[in-house]
Amino acid sequence: AVITGACDKDSQCGGGMCCAVSIWVKSIRICTPMGKLGDSCHPLTRKVPFFGRRMHHTCPCLPGLACLRTSFNRFICLAQK
């Protein structure tokens, strides 16, 4: 597994990471840490493992956290109720 750096699919990344689109270069995907408590997220980000190529810049939240709405268009990783 690729621990950091360029990737194509989740399977190339280490545990606790996903293969998300780079925030600097949209044509590149990089192994990115899953969302921690308080991190921004999107509720429809594909769960890990995803077998296709992601479009989002962020990974889903870590296990035990959920991507919850805090205001109209803002979602963050929070502890599951």
Partner: antibody
Framework: EVQLVQSGAEVKKPGASVKVSCKAS????????MHWVRQAPGQGLEWIGY????????TYNQKFKGRVTITVDKSTSTAYLELSSLRSEDTAVYYC??????????????WGQGTLVTVSS | DIVMTQSPDSLAVSLGERATINCKAS??????????MNWYQQKPGQPPKLLIY???NLESGVPDRFSGSGSGTDFTLTISSLQAEDVAVYYC?????????FGQGTKVEIK
């Protein structure tokens, strides 16, 4: 060749339940999610929900929450839709549709032939 | 829920002419610079067929006379040169927010 073959038409009474099956072939079943969509006679399309065929995790349209259950049997590469407490307005063609794995675009690239469910007393 | 409104409800176009279908979302379906909008074609008695995903990406095997454009709340499906086999109902679908919702459909006929 990717194929989704659904079970046959059903006639049910109000208050009953129905379970529709969708057998997949021609691809790695657990690598793709499966959606369910319905279409009332002469009407448009309505998304019911989807399931990860890998983990079994589901996401449902809140409109159907509590009445719908989507499951998979990995050993037979089959997805199931169960809808309970049927009413006349549930009369529709029910489609399973494979997610195309186009990232978060959730596009449905292969569809079953549809199963007509008629709810009538 | 995001409401998708297509216009017109139906249109008749001569063979070889351009057909344009519009779809308006009740709120933006963009995220991180991408537009989460799909287009489907449905012929009578058949299931829908995916034409365009993520607003402008042509599905494999779909003729290149079909194209999608737009961002935010306003999207367009264009058939550059209408063929007889394009007679169908066309649906837009947003996939940026659960529940995924479809437009009411636009029926395309030959004039």
């Amino acid at each position: 060749e990717v194929q989704l073959v659904q079970s046959g038409a059903e006639v049910k009474k109000p208050g009953a339940s129905v379970k529709v099956s969708c057998k997949a072939s021609g691809y790695s079943f657990t690598d793709y999610d499966m959606h369910w969509v319905r279409q009332a006679p002469g009407q448009g399309l309505e998304w019911i929900g989807y399931i990860s065929c890998y983990s079994g995790a589901t996401t449902y349209n809140q409109k159907f929450k509590g009445r719908v259950t989507i499951t998979v049997d990995k050993s037979t590469s089959t997805a199931y839709l169960e809808l309970s407490s049927l009413r006349s307005e549930d009369t529709a063609v029910y489609y399973c549709a494979r997610d195309g794995n186009y990232g978060e675009a959730y596009a449905m690239d292969y569809w079953g032939q549809g199963t007509l469910v008629t709810v009538s007393s | 829920d995001i409401v998708m409104t297509q216009s017109p409800d139906s249109l008749a176009v001569s063979l070889g002419e351009r057909a344009t279908i519009n779809c308006k979302a009740s709120q933006s379906v963009d995220y991180d610079g991408d537009s989460y909008m799909n287009w489907y074609q449905q012929k009578p008695g058949q299931p829908p067929k995916l034409l365009i995903y993520a607003a402008s990406n042509l599905e494999s095997g779909v003729p290149d006379r079909f194209s999608g454009s737009g961002s935010g709340t306003d999207f367009t499906l264009t058939i550059s040169s209408l063929q007889a086999e394009d007679v169908a109902v066309y649906y837009c679908q947003q996939i940026n927010e659960d529940p995924f919702t479809f437009g009411q459909g636009t029926k395309v006929e030959i004039k």
